[in-house]
């Protein structure tokens, strides 16, 4: 799978994580920080 950094318009897309662009899948993906989940790493879990 080809990946690259997200475009600058997606700054802030991932609330608590790193935004990755999955080129072949034509979509952005959030790699969440430890303790966060959700499509955009918006949920905190204990």
């Amino acid at each position: 799978v080809s990946i690259t950094k997200c475009n600058s318009d997606m700054n802030g897309y991932c609330l608590h994580g790193q935004c990755i662009y999955l080129v072949d899948m034509s979509q952005n993906y959030c790699r969440c920080e430890v303790g966060y989940t959700g499509v955009r790493c918006e949920h905190f879990y204990l």
């Epitope: 475009n7 600058s8 318009d9 897309y13 034509s26 979509q27 499509v39």
Partner: antibody
Amino acid sequence: QDQLVQSGAEVKKPGASVKVSCKASGFNIKDTYIQWVRQAPGQGLEWMGRIDPLRRNTKYREKFEGRVTITADTSTNTAYMELSSLRSEDTAVYYCVRSGTRFDFWGQGTLVTVSS
Amino acid sequence: DIQMTQSPSSLSASVGDRVTITCKASQDIHKYIAWYQQKPGQAPRLLIQYTSTLQPGVPSRFSGSGSGTDYTFTISSLQPEDIATYYCLQYDNLRTFGGGTKVEIK
């Protein structure tokens, strides 16, 4: 499957406002950005602005600043585009477009006609 | 705002010809360019995103290339069903469409 269903065609008088809705099904708009694009008859595509429904953050093309308002109601999974002070040049098909989780998935378009 | 200058605005070519459309951005868009095909009365159809990634179901005669500010879209062998208007879109910093290229059969 994923869908963006827009409201029906509108006819408006010059100076009036129009509000076009875009209802999502099959996905949560909070996971995406919703863009708005328009196309006047026989003309090209023109990006108007977008909303991040989760953060309620909006960005607009400079030429539309102050005349366009993009909103989202996450409880009904619907985005809206309101354009005020309508003039004849605003006659166009208006499209909502999902981006983010999937690249550029388009609604069917809404024709807005501005005529006296 | 980033400006996208698309050329030519229209072209006429024969079936089987190689067709090339260019888009020039006013600043580096880091390969974040997409190409759309639009036929009369239809919504635009995404063909290519991230400069050269073909969407599922799109024929391999369509291709894209480029980097920095200069990008190219190519139809290697024009077919009658390719008659349409083609648009580039930069999506690096907000969004801007090119002015479109109307492709006709000679």
